[in-house]
Amino acid sequence: LRPPRVHNSEENTMRALTLKDILNGTFSYKTFFPNWISGQEYLHQSADNNIVLYNIETGQSYTILSNRTMKSVNASNYGLSPDRQFVYLESDYSKLWRYSYTATYYIYDLSNGEFVRGNELPRPIQYLCWSPVGSKLAYVYQNNIYLKQRPGDPPFQITFNGRENKIFNGIPDWVYEEEMLATKYALWWSPNGKFLAYAEFNDTDIPVIAYSYYGDEQYPRTINIPYPKAGAKNPFVRIFIIDTTYPAYVGPQEVPVPAMIASSDYYFSWLTWVTDERVCLQWLKRVQNVSVLSICDFREDWQTWDCPKTQEHIEESRTGWAGGFFVSTPVFSYDAISYYKIFSDKDGYKHIHYIKDTVENAIQITSGKWEAINIFRVTQDSLFYSSNEFEDYPGRRNIYRISIGSYPPSKKCVTCHLRKERCQYYTASFSDYAKYYALVCYGPGIPISTLHDGRTDQEIKILEENKELENALKNIQLPKEEIKKLEVDEITLWYKMILPPQFDRSKKYPLLIQVYGGPCSQSVRSVFAVNWISYLASKEGMVIALVDGRGTAFQGDKLLYAVYRKLGVYEVEDQITAVRKFIEMGFIDEKRIAIWGWSYGGYVSSLALASGTGLFKCGIAVAPVSSWEYYASVYTERFMGLPTKDDNLEHYKNSTVMARAEYFRNVDYLLIHGTADDNVHFQNSAQIAKALVNAQVDFQAMWYSDQNHGLSGLSTNHLYTHMTHFLKQCFSLSD
């Protein structure tokens, strides 16, 4: 059936995506996350940069901080004190690593409309936060922690041993920031601000990675980062808690590490306050299959913390590592001792469990051949969580509510039927006591953010629906996307295929595999994106496929832990298997197949190209790992064990890209890396290049001077332009 003529003419006015569209971010979307300040109020930065307070119940809103005040100190961020008397304004943002940055902070007094003068904060500050009640300030400056009872007061110095690259107080070192805490901070206020807990990281004995930063000077400077690679000496961590009401009285009190963890190298993984006088610490053995959750109580008589063994809960994995990417954190119930936590059930699926006394007696709250992904909030009568249960699509996320006040508990999917076609991947943000919540839908349709009543789940209003984006896309020929699965040898391989707008199954198309494939990752997700691969399908007529193979997340431990101690084997096999299945579908030109990936994906794409299958004509590796001996201890050892003879050295050696240098002879290989990559060091690509040269194998390469793992700014444009040329040449597409 031919569509009516009018559609044809409309089709003619529609255009394909251009690379320029992608590089300019023309089709980027917005989300709306309320900055909750109570059960029914939130702050939001308006389009004209005023900070506005919204009251859901009265429907009123008013500006608490004008754009003029923001502009007066060039503020790019703000934070309201819980007593609403002060706001900190953040300016001079200077990025350090993934989460960390330094900034200048100004305190604005809302009661008199003036900046606080006297006892101003030093600069630059590494981290600053308000207490959860009142307006105490804790901040980290030059690796030491300071406390102010009020913004205008002189500071009380809590730690004195902070030293650049040696001792970190209240902030993580590189490896803890990137691989364990995933935050820029390592200090935690108790719920009412009585106590302040903090971590001290001692990096004195950690080997240092050094690389040149070229800059503009006559001599490049050297960046030095204490960075433990696999098997190296690790940071040494201690946890302290100080009474902020009388900080000088007994000073910081150390919370001892559990004896079962203390006997060998260990990590601290997270801290959760339960009440002002009860805290929960999580610890992990260096061999990351044993985690201990320890609930500690303040002992008034001793003025210190006691962590009874009866309040120690051990989580152990016999088939892989503990947890998913990280060990999950507990969400405590109102009795302040029992908690909800996600961990593997007996069938090997991550589910919510309720722990009242021992882990052995845990009550399973969710179950099935799907996974619970995040616990958002526990109230007196409800537990809100996300999972990929609905319709058995692992790449979806829906929000559920379980009634915990009644027995048996009843489960309701809050999001499954709201905007079924448009929205299949949600996250949520809850106000105090879950009185209200915002839902943020990421796709597969255009993202939309909505506000809901926490009792009835009724939608109150749309917070952001991306109307401008919707209008802008009306005359764009977007590619078609489909998410399906392949069943191969008892393994389910989910894939996303991105097809050119006028896709015709009877024709042959070049295929590009985009791969990440790292442990506990997921690439096949029902989310909206207009990005480089959308352009390649829309304009250049390529078919792009993403495949989640063994080692990927949210489909059970069998798939997840399949790669344990064997990185670089099954991830590659599964990409190759999928390509063979795609060829069988009949519309892939098997002489024009490429693979590309970034980071872990660069490692997998390199190994796939060097697999000797002859499947791939060409491929690209951006900032790849080339040997697991070069990557961070915390990440690498979680999946690979130690690079020692009596552990797993053999597979460390077998799984390098360099060991396969000869196999690159019959493929076109483009190797790309930033010289200032603090994460996957340039060393990785330098070693690949050396091995290829030594094997006399031709290849292409591009470095980005002074760029880190993200290759941002102008480098991004250059990178995608360069990769586009490479692929078009490989696929014999006209430029």
């Epitope: 040494f236 201690r238 150390e254 001892p256 590490v257 559990p258 004896a259 079962m260 203390a262 006997s263 060998s264 002992r299 001793w302 006691d306 962590c307 009874p308 063994k309 009866t310």
Partner: antibody, heavy 118, light 107 residues
């Protein structure tokens, strides 16, 4: 095999201080908490506190707060217990003992007799 | 602090008798209780850990039971070598406490 060897007997005057050492061998010294326990003549066992050799972190029983100091030297795998302002009722045998997660105090030093007498 | 109360203070028994010592904790300590035997002039020796686990090398006539706040050390058939003082110790808390001891003497 695990061994804890303590320093020899001491005689001290009231008001003085005593420092008892405990040298560990046969295991990773930094991996186990070290406790100190004392026993006055004809009396029961009294827990004094512990030190975690890895960090030097300590916890003392209330009876000894302010008078006891536990330290360690990891380079020679030795723990120390110093008791100050000695009184005659501090006359006792002082033991160091290793803390195993499951077994509690599984290995003990041979004991050091401290006599406080004017 | 967790108080540990042992009873009896003295147990007079004959060789071959069954001996029972109890230990009561002032609050729940789970199974984190150890029993020690001490002979005059000697170092305490670990007998039982985790309330009921027998330390290797300790004769099987020794057994421990209990959890929470009530614990028992039983010697099924007293031998001449068993006449000594016995101590319980809780190790649930970072702040360890011993019972006051029970002397097992020959009747």
């Amino acid at each position: 095999q695990v061994q804890l060897v303590q320093s020899g007997a001491e005689v001290k005057k009231p008001g003085a201080s005593v420092k008892v050492s405990c040298k560990a061998s046969g295991y990773t010294f930094t991996g186990y908490y070290m406790h100190w326990v004392r026993q006055a003549p004809g009396q029961g066992l009294e827990w004094m506190g512990w030190i975690y050799p890895n960090t030097g972190g300590t916890n003392y029983a209330q009876n000894f707060q302010g008078r006891v100091t536990m330290t360690r030297d990891t380079s020679i795998s030795t723990a120390y217990m110093e008791l100050s302002s000695l009184r005659s009722d501090d006359t006792a045998v002082y033991y160091c003992a290793r803390d195993d997660y499951n077994k509690n105090l599984d290995y003990w030093g041979q004991g050091t007799l401290v006599t406080v007498s004017s | 602090d967790i108080q540990m109360t042992q009873s009896p203070s003295t147990l007079s028994a004959s060789v071959g008798d069954r001996g029972t010592i109890t230990c009561r904790a002032s609050q729940s300590i789970g199974s984190w209780l150890a029993w020690y035997q001490q002979k005059p002039g000697k170092t305490p020796k670990l007998l039982i850990y985790k309330a009921s686990s027998l330390e290797s090398g300790v004769p099987s006539r020794f057994s421990g039971s209990g959890s929470g706040t009530e614990f028992t050390l039983t010697i099924s058939s007293l031998q001449p070598d068993d006449f000594a003082t016995y101590y319980c110790q809780q190790y649930n808390s970072y702040f360890r406490t011993f019972g006051q001891g029970t002397k097992v003497e020959i009747k």
